[in-house]
């Protein structure tokens, strides 16, 4: 289709070479059509399209993206050539960060309903660069954290670096749904719910004396629980002593439960204690059983391939440890009698 | 018993201003709350003014044609107040003040039966 | 802001019959809304909050549904005491649980 009547919107995407993040594109389509298929009120009240309006239907369900090519070829879809972008609805998620992500990427409705919707269709240049050394170091992660049920805030990463009072005007989204609202480079969060997690997409205009372009950043936001107090606990074992039987082939499980750490390094190991002498056993990688908001569950086995004599006179002993403090159950293995 | 009791209505002129006291009883303020001014003009519908927010950012929240002529503040853990300046006849309402918040905005609901303030000459 | 637009603005039903009152959001408030009764020199009364959760003491005749942009109250089995000024308000305000914009109103008229 001809892509001359879209209209065109240009974004740049600085990413740090330290960091994951991902970025998006949203097919900013005029109104009204969009809201048919995508999220309502993705354009701001000031954003007023210059096209003719879309005489879409309402069994629109999706749009369709393509990247054109630099050397003039063809359009190509975008799901069939390019493993590390995904579209979620009316959104482009780009999982990896690149220069090679470089380029014009063009939406439009799946379904053409009318003679006005073939030039229903937005051409969006993507211009992608690495941050420079030059740029603000104490920039605000693509990654940030929200303490439930306390205060927090939601950064710009690449307005960080500037004070409020500096600081252009910011067009922030929540999930892809536009937070009409906020309009700084920061986002006040007066009381943390699980509402908060999400994705935020956070844009402002750059303008030089030729064209003006819209910076845009990704931020992936978790609510969390305050980092725990306690040192880890050992479910299982529970008794200091397994009744077992000689030859036979035994697994010795270790379950423990560590409270939430932002910082999380969690430690379990078998270790074999034999009179004087103690050393750690090479077992299975631990695995986790069970993870909630507040807390994980963390398995790690001993495997014998048969139970010895020699096994009897040895204290087999799952050693936890935290950033808080460790602890230890010891197992002494007695043979079964009868 | 949870209360809140509006203070400071009165007849005022045009042009002059006026601080409305919000006096919680049974409670004071704290985290999860917003304490909101709301207006109702004689016969009309509700009209959102402010709120505040009674937790550490102490962020305010207004209605776009409030900004810069009504300004609510918290005095202490048991007092909100609503200063108005530049007054017209237009501001004649009853005004209420009503706690909310908690996630989905009203799960503390709470109203006080309202001032009345009269702007004439 | 958020305008909120509330129809009808008047709405007239015998006893024991039903009344719908809609609500529309300028924009997506998900399911942050809340429903109140107004009773002449009386301040409002909570009745309905997250678009369909009952406040307490609230008998469940009253019924709220809806998200994003539009929301209904819907009042079954009307008694005489129902007659009262209903407003939505809108109780997000970018990320936060702010109650703010109301709708217009609705006068129900018991008959």
């Known amino acids: 289709f001809n892509i001359s009547g879209c209209s065109t919107k240009k974004l740049l995407w600085t990413y740090s070479t330290r960091s994951e993040e991902e970025f998006v594109l949203f097919c900013d389509l005029p109104e009204p059509q969009k809201s048919h298929f995508c999220h309502r009120n993705r354009l701001s009240p000031k954003q007023v399209p210059e096209h003719l309006p879309f005489m879409g239907s309402n069994d629109l369900s999706d749009v369709q993206w393509y990247q054109q090519p630099s050397n003039g070829d063809p359009l190509e879809d975008i799901r069939k050539s390019y493993p590390h972008i995904i579209q979620d609805k009316c959104t482009l998620h780009f999982l990896t960060p690149g220069v090679n992500n470089s380029g014009s990427y063009i939406c439009r409705p799946k379904m053409i309903k009318s003679p006005y919707d073939v030039a229903c269709c937005v051409k969006m240049i993507l211009e992608v660069k690495p941050q420079t050394n030059a740029s603000c170091e104490y920039s605000a992660s693509h990654k940030q954290d929200l303490l439930l049920g306390s205060t927090g805030s939601i950064s710009c990463p690449s307005l960080s670096c500037q004070s409020d009072a500096q600081s252009p005007a910011v067009t922030w989204y929540k999930n892809g749904k536009l937070l009409s609202v906020e309009r700084s480079n920061r986002i006040v969060v007066d009381e943390v719910y699980d509402y908060h997690q999400g994705t935020y997409v956070c844009d402002y205009t750059q303008s030089d004396t030729v064209s003006s372009w819209t910076v845009r950043a990704v931020v992936q936001v978790r609510t969390i629980v305050g980092d725990t107090k306690l040192k880890p606990d050992i479910l299982d074992p529970v008794e200091d002593t397994l009744e077992v039987e000689l030859g036979k082939p035994l697994t010795i499980s270790c379950k423990a439960r560590f409270g939430f750490e932002r910082v999380f390094n969690p430690v379990i190991k078998w270790y074999i204690k034999d009179s004087d002498l103690e050393w750690e056993v090479s077992v299975p990688e631990a695995k986790s059983i069970k993870s909630t908001l507040k807390d994980e569950i963390i398995e790690r086995n001993i495997i014998l391939e048969k139970v010895t004599q020699r096994d009897l006179r040895r204290k087999f002993v799952c050693f936890v440890q935290n950033s808080i403090g460790n602890t230890t159950q010891s197992v002494q293995l007695k043979e079964k009698r009868g | 018993q949870e209360q809140l009791v509006e203070s400071g209505g009165g007849l005022v002129q045009p042009e002059g201003s006026l601080t409305l006291t919000c006096t919680a009883s049974g409670f004071s303020f704290s985290s999860s709350y917003y304490m909101c001014w709301v207006r109702q003009a004689p016969g009309k519908g509700l009209e959102w003014i402010a709120c505040?927010?009674?937790?550490?950012?102490?962020?305010t929240y207004y209605a776009s044609w409030a900004k810069g002529r009504l300004t609510i503040s918290k005095i202490s853990s048991t007092t909100v107040t609503l200063q108005m300046t530049s007054l017209t006849a237009a501001d004649t309402a009853t005004y209420f003040c009503a706690r909310g918040g908690g996630s989905g905005g009203v799960d503390n609901n709470l109203w006080g039966p309202g001032t009345l303030v009269t702007v004439s000459s | 802001d958020v305008v909120m637009t509330q129809t009808p603005s008047s709405v007239s039903a015998a006893v024991g019959g039903t009344v719908t009152i809609n609500c529309r959001a300028s924009e997506d408030i998900e399911r942050f809304l809340a429903w109140y009764q107004q009773k002449p020199g009386q301040p409002p009364k909570l009745l309905i909050y997250k678009a369909s959760t009952l406040a307490s003491g609230v008998p469940s005749r009253f019924k709220g549904s809806g998200s994003g942009t539009d929301f209904t109250l819907t009042i079954s089995d009307l008694e005489c005491a129902d007659a009262a000024t209903y407003y939505c308000q809108c109780t997000l305000y970018g990320v936060n649980f702010v109650p703010n914009a109301f709708g217009g109103g609705t006068e129900v008229v018991v008959k």
């Open positions: 505040i927010y009674a937790g550490s950012s102490g962020s």
